[in-house]
Amino acid sequence: EVEKTACPSGKKAREIDESLIFYKKWELEACVDAALLATQMDRVNAIPFTYEQLDVLKHKLDELYPQGYPESVIQHLGYLFLKMSPEDIRKWNVTSLETLKALLEVNKGHEMSPQVATLIDRFVKGRGQLDKDTLDTLTAFYPGYLCSLSPEELSSVPPSSIWAVRPQDLDTCDPRQLDVLYPKARLAFQNMNGSEYFVKIQSFLGGAPTEDLKALSQQNVSMDLATFMKLRTDAVLPLTVAEVQKLLGPHVEGLKAEERHRPVRDWILRQRQDDLDTLGLGLQGGIPNGYLVLDLSMQEALS
């Protein structure tokens, strides 16, 4: 707490300008009116204040707005945003995307801080859903943002927002997240033709069920091995050798290099060795000829 001292004669601030950077801590406290500061917040960001000076300015705003800052002030916080705690931010009601962008810009190039995470959470909750413009903005600043959300949170993403998602935005998503995102992507891109559809849906295929993979195998999509390796194991296992061959096209040769890794390893174990041999890749580990394959899951279902 800065002790209250009278402002020296002639030092009372008439406006927020660069002369204030020469004020000592106590002079800023005594000579800058909080209401003046609030109305001229847009000027603060242009002035190279030290962290000590920014602390004093924040203290003034806290006293003026104990229940939380109005959006007119928040939008112009600039570098002062870095001084805010998550507790401060929880008091805010941020509704404008422009305000969000302005504050994210201050933190640009840094990892998502607790302050930024709180700000985003407040903003998205206030909007009720993660709309396209918001998602566009957030993934532009934080490509991994989407994958930081829980499956429950992702369920509030409308299919129309999926258009804003870039492949790199999904790099760190796990299968549970892709399970939620894939049906939304399928819906969003449903009116596209075959090749264009595949380009768009490819990043989301880690959430695709078997029947969708079977359908894709009929469309000459030539899926690359990197995408294939990210598919759900349970979705790949029922695919026949012929379907995988059609799905991968010329990339089928890459299976050999991946034969010890999931889902390829598990898929090989489910195929007849005869069928695997037709690929001519030397894949080993399939079901030997003459063996009877019982689908126990089907038997359990019948009983």
């Epitope: 660069e18 020469f22 000592k24 002035i47 190279p48 030290t50 962290y51 000590e52 602390d55």
Partner: antibody, heavy 119, light 110 residues
Framework: QVQLVESGGGVVQPGRSLRLSCAAS????????MSWVRQAPGKGLEWIGV???????FYADWVKGRFTISRDNSKNTLYLQMSSLRAEDTAVYYC?????????????WGQGTLVTVSS | DYQMTQSPSSLSASVGDRVTITCQAS??????LAWYQQKPGKAPKLLIY???DLASGVPSRFSGSGSGTDFTLTISSLQCEDAATYYC????????????FGGGTKVEIK
């Protein structure tokens, strides 16, 4: 290559003046606050002053007007003008980039230039 | 005035030892503290900023902690190349400052 190179050091008589330069390459000096720091032989680091991105200058309390920091953005160069030099000003003088627009840690240093004040 | 006091002024330790250096500010500087390493005849090098963030390229055996007035630099397992003088510096204010740096701690290898 990002670097700061100081020059202008040498032997100078007490009471005389000297101007040190710090030339930057690979970075735009106008985007950062810049500082001067010195180190007397066998002693610790001593902060001299800083010039922020707007050209405002701040000095350590002991400087008392004898040193002046300036910058020429068109030449991407920082300067330290020293006057009324004394024997105790003998030191290696470093320029350093401040990781902020105003004041903060020094994340890039020059190699230093030695100033010897002696008659 | 903001003053920085470092201790000890020197220490000697063996390779593999855990080494701790402290820095005290005369008044709160929150977490705005940096640590530097300086080897003889060389310019200082930034090790840690904002009290605990490791600068780019600095080995993970270096760590920093503290906030307010009391700060610590720790070398978890001392290596031969860590023989140097270490300085702290406040990055909170540039007014009322006699010296932004602490007095330094010389670390020698036994």
């Amino acid at each position: 290559q990002v670097q700061l190179v100081e020059s202008g050091g040498g032997v100078v008589q007490p009471g005389r003046s000297l101007r040190l330069s710090c030339a930057a390459s690979g970075i735009d000096l106008s985007s950062y606050a810049m500082s001067w720091v010195r180190q007397a032989p066998g002693k610790g680091l001593e902060w001299i002053g800083v010039i922020d991105i707007s050209g405002n200058r701040f000095y350590a309390d002991w400087v008392k007007g004898r040193f002046t920091i300036s910058r020429d953005n068109s030449k991407n160069t920082l300067y330290l003008q020293m006057s009324s030099l004394r024997a105790e000003d003998t030191a290696v003088y470093y320029c350093a980039r401040v990781d902020s627009r105003a004041w903060g840690p020094f994340n890039l240093w020059g190699q230093g230039t030695l100033v010897t004040v002696s008659s | 005035d903001y003053q920085m006091t470092q201790s000890p002024s020197s220490l000697s330790a063996s390779v593999g030892d855990r080494v701790t250096i402290t820095c005290q500010a005369s008044q709160s500087i929150f977490s705005y503290l940096a640590w530097y390493q300086q080897k003889p005849g060389k310019a200082p090098k930034l090790l840690i900023y904002d009290a605990s963030d490791l600068a780019s390229g600095v080995p993970s055996r270096f760590s920093g902690s503290g906030s307010g007035t009391d700060f610590t630099l720790t070398i978890s397992s001392l290596q031969c190349e860590d023989a140097a003088t270490y300085y702290c510096q406040q990055g909170y204010t540039r007014s009322d400052v006699d010296n932004a740096f602490g007095g330094g701690t010389k670390v020698e290898i036994k």
